[in-house]
């Protein structure tokens, strides 16, 4: 058993039929010695008396809020949560496996630049009685500070018969140099509690590997005189690291007809303009990627030809 | 491939295309190592990230863009180490910090060159003959060093009398390639920045 936060404890259980469970001793936080009784949750049934209560925790019915009282007055609470281990593996029932970039990916993180700020998100089908807390650091043996905000519900989606909820959190490395060469990864730890079930999820990464620039901005078309051709221009996104001559981007330019049958034309360029033959109903799209370290491409910025 | 490719555009910072070739070569070599050594811990997640230049050179600090010198987090370990002149410096751009930066890059390349050559000598003794260093990568390191044209003492190639442990050597190769790729990215960023300024 270990303390998650004040008056909240996690009992780690090997989860299999007829498992013996864990013996837990609860101590009432009071100077009083006599006349103390114990109850569980909303029940008025007295479970025991005395300053300590010994219980055998085997299943979720044994978890919950234990309260010690004296003469109708509440003295203290202890909330017991269960963390299940099945076949030597901690349960992952609360979050959904996103399977990207690989199986058993529960947390996904992205950074728009090298400033040390990043966002992580996760998915669940659970809608109520759910809390998350997030901690992060650079390295684990001698951790350096990363500050994370509160996790918030950022999106709801309908997937077939199920509703899916996306939660996200923003974190910022306390002293980040955009030009630094990372040798220790960022560690992100998420504690998830659903009713009386506790689970924890972790992710480890270098900022350089989770970079995904915002789409290029101000994508514009300028018709060229006496020609079917147009000059396409765009700019670095505002959120990208500066100076741009050091943190350079490369771009992918695509011309796509309305119907899927029409040939798609796609090229790469380091410049922020190109000349394009604009056909009726076609669209021009541009996306960005770090020029020197190939992490993710940005989403597309698009403009219609008409 | 028929005609030789022409020299870089006039006025172009002379080391830029060498540094781009370097990044391409080390990225290709790393990819080859990951594929060939698929049953060894050779991915970014599996290896220990070591920097053989740590405490010996200060490339990131010495080559910091002016715009980042206001960022306190970037100035933690700004040391001054080398000062000399090299051929990548167009005279009007010659400055103390730039010379320091380019000589630091040169020292990095020299250190990695020695490590890679030593390692290749060991890998050539491996009866499995599983992986060797790409000669193109070694040539590109050499070209960039020549373009930087700093005079410094030659570092003797390390030789070891004991029987090489090929498993350890291959893991060390992965560690070196990952670190060198990260440094090659920094070098490319620096050259691009200097070319624009």
């Amino acid at each position: 058993i270990w303390e998650l936060k004040k008056d909240v404890y996690v009992v780690e259980l090997d989860w299999y039929p007829d498992a013996p469970g864990e013996m837990v001793v609860l101590t009432c936080d009071t100077p009083e010695e006599d006349g103390i009784t114990w109850t569980l949750d909303q029940s008025s049934e007295v479970l025991g008396s005395g300053k300590t209560l010994t219980i055998q925790v085997k299943e979720f019915g044994d978890a919950g809020q234990y309260t010690c009282h004296k003469g109708g007055e509440v003295l203290s609470h202890s909330l017991l949560l269960l963390h299940k281990k099945e076949d030597g593996i901690w349960s992952t029932d609360i979050l959904k496996d996103q399977k990207e970039p690989k199986n058993k990916t529960f947390l996904r993180c992205e950074a728009k630049n090298y400033s040390g700020r990043f966002t992580c998100w996760w998915l669940t089908t659970i809608s109520t009685d759910l809390t998350f807390s997030v901690k992060s650091s650079r390295g684990s043996s001698d951790p350096q500070g990363v500050t994370c905000g509160a996790a918030t519900l950022s999106a709801e989606r309908v997937r077939g018969d199920n509703k899916e909820y996306e939660y996200s959190v923003e974190c910022q490395e306390d002293s980040a140099c955009p030009a630094a060469e990372e040798s220790l990864p960022i560690e992100v730890m998420v504690d998830a509690v659903h009713k009386l079930k506790y689970e924890n999820y972790t992710s480890s990464f270098f900022i350089r590997d989770i970079i995904k620039p915002d789409p290029p901005k101000n994508l514009q078309l300028k018709p060229l005189k006496n020609s079917r051709q147009v000059e396409v221009s765009w700019e670095y996104p505002d959120t990208w690291s500066t100076p741009h001559s050091y943190f350079s981007l490369t771009f992918c330019v695509q011309v796509q007809g309305k119907s899927k049958r029409e040939k798609k034309d796609r090229v790469f360029t380091d410049k922020t303009s190109a000349t394009v033959i604009c056909r009726k109903n076609a669209s021009i799209s541009v996306r960005a990627q770090d020029r020197y370290y190939s992490s993710s491409w940005s989403e597309w910025a698009s403009v219609p030809c008409s | 491939r028929n005609l030789p490719v022409a020299t870089p555009d006039p006025g172009m910072f002379p080391c830029l295309h060498h540094s781009q070739n370097l990044l391409r070569a080390v990225s290709n070599m790393l990819q080859k190592a990951r594929q060939t050594l698929e049953f060894y811990p050779c991915t970014s997640e599996e290896i220990d990230h070591e920097d053989i230049t740590k405490d010996k050179t200060s490339t990131v600090e010495a080559c910091l863009p002016l715009e980042l010198t206001k960022n306190e987090s970037c100035l933690n370990s700004r040391e001054t180490s080398f000062i000399t002149n090299g051929s990548c410096l167009a005279s009007r751009k010659t400055s103390f910090m730039m010379a320091l930066c380019l000589s630091s890059i040169y020292e990095d390349l020299k250190m990695y060159q020695v490590e890679f050559k030593t390692m290749n000598a060991k890998l050539l003794m491996d009866p499995k003959r599983q992986i060797f260093l790409d000669q193109n990568m070694l040539a590109v390191i050499d070209e960039l060093m020549q373009a930087l044209n700093f005079n410094s003492e030659t570092v003797p190639q390390k030789s070891s009398l004991e029987e090489p442990d090929f498993y350890k050597t291959k893991i060390k190769l992965c560690i070196l390639l990952h670190a060198f790729r990260i440094r090659a990215v920094t070098i490319d960023r620096v050259m691009s920045y200097l070319n624009a300024s």
Epitope: V253, V255, R266, V267, F268, T269 | A6
Partner: nanobody, 124 residues
Amino acid sequence: QVQLVESGGGLVQPGGSLRLSCAASGRTLSSYTMAWFRQAPGKEREFVATISPVGFIMDYADSVKGRFTISRDNTKNTVYLQMNSLKHEDTALYYCATDLGRKLGTQSREYGYWGQGTQVTVSS
């Protein structure tokens, strides 16, 4: 192995037009970008224009924008350079190049395969 053969060069008066062709053999080039470069005597080889695999996306050197048009016919494995309003300073040996990639590169070192060139002379 890719072979590139340029043709269409010649002597032309200032203000005149020429159309250069670059025929490729040894490989179908419909998936790759193609480019034109030029080299005047005693000068560096300079970028003129480059075109995407399908032919909808191009890039031009500032000095030729609005006067030159690059195009391609993938059924013939050929790239063209239509040169209008020619000036004295357009006099050069014009080369066709590819690197079997999809980058709109503007530097000669980005291209690995080159033709032998076709001479364009603009003179009155």
